[in-house]
Interface confidence: low
Amino acid sequence: CVICDPSVVLALKSLEKDYLPGHLDAKHHKAMMERVENAVKDFQELSLNEDAYMGVVDEATLQKGSWSLLKDLKRITDSDVKGDLFVKELFWMLHLQKETFATYVARFQKEAYCPNKCGVMLQTLIWCKNCKKEVHACRKSYDCGERNVEVPQMEDMILDCELNWHQASEGLTDYSFYRVWGNNTETLVSKGKEATLTKPMVGPEDAGSYRCELGSVNSSPATIINFHVTVLPKMIKEEKPSPNIVTPGEATTESSISLQPLQPEKMLASR
């Protein structure tokens, strides 16, 4: 797959034109470069310890693999080694770089390939067989579950629709937040690039169901998250009556504070 990186192709050309003359008998140049190119192309035939190799990588994995290869190729050419020793060293290096690339690919397949647990993620991948870049849709269940949110009355409600893979996904459009009513109707509350919906100083009327939808270029939503918002009763200060007996030196102006929820009828009256 590293052959898909133009800098690797350039480095191999430079090896042929700039390094081989003066370091290897001219009659071996053609056969040598064929072997080198085959060895580099052979990077696509990987045997991974646990997973089957899928034959695709992302840009970051390709860059990592090619940078590692180029670094070691430079070490060899900088050493000015010649003849059989050069050939031997070069092919050892290519073998070990293939091993290294296999570890990068294994990590990519485990951690970075379709990392979304739900929704649809669009990921640009490089197909090693033909070096083509294509956008791959990682399709999981659209529904990314439900979140229960509790907000004390008069505080800010924040509904966060962002999932860790959203930043890495391509083709995402807008976050839309809907207020969902009991009779299967809904109202669009906000739409835009902001992944959170913030409602300052919530009241009891803000309790209920909300839905977030993240749109994507291929029309189907990338993510759907449902929120169930509970507005907790406001905590108020209430003065306790002072005790009848006042001991000498005791302050009478201070009262102890207890936190009590609003009575239901008071809550209704506040609407």
Epitope: D72, R75, I76, S79, V81, L85, K88, E89, W92, M93, H95, L96
Partner: nanobody, 117 residues
Framework: QVQLVESGGGLVQPGGSLRLSCAAS????????MTWVRQAPGKALEWVSS?????????YYSDTVKGRFTISRDNTKNMLYLQMNSLKPEDTAVYYC?????????RGQGTQVTVSS
């Protein structure tokens, strides 16, 4: 014929260090890459580190040991070394040195490394 004799293994506590040695004979040591591989009980053979020839040898390490192990060679003495620092229980295995860079090349009898408290 090729002879490789490993030594330096033993029992060590987690976080400790060991230095493995491999005495090579029966081939031109300075003309070959050398490799350390290991095999934990019931597990497959695992590549640990290789060293090539140039400039005293270019080292390569597996991700599991990178930053903790150091491979080196002394061509004048036909010796290969593996300095193992910050050892972990999962480093427990029989360690073999091998001629060349593949784990299926000729290798020695191995030396047991046990990391345990």
């Amino acid at each position: 014929q090729v002879q490789l004799v490993e030594s330096g293994g033993g029992l060590v506590q987690p976080g400790g260090s060991l230095r493995l040695s491999c005495a090579a004979s029966g081939f031109t040591f300075s003309n070959d890459a050398m490799t350390w591989v290991r095999q934990a009980p019931g597990k497959a053979l695992e590549w640990v580190s290789s060293i090539t020839l140039l400039g005293g040898g270019i080292p390569y390490y597996s991700d599991t040991v990178k930053g903790r192990f150091t491979i080196s060679r002394d061509n004048t003495k036909n010796m290969l070394y593996l300095q193992m620092n910050s050892l972990k229980p999962e480093d427990t295995a029989v360690y073999y040195c091998a001629k060349g860079f593949k784990s299926d090349y000729p290798r020695g009898q191995g030396t047991q490394v046990t990391v345990s408290s």
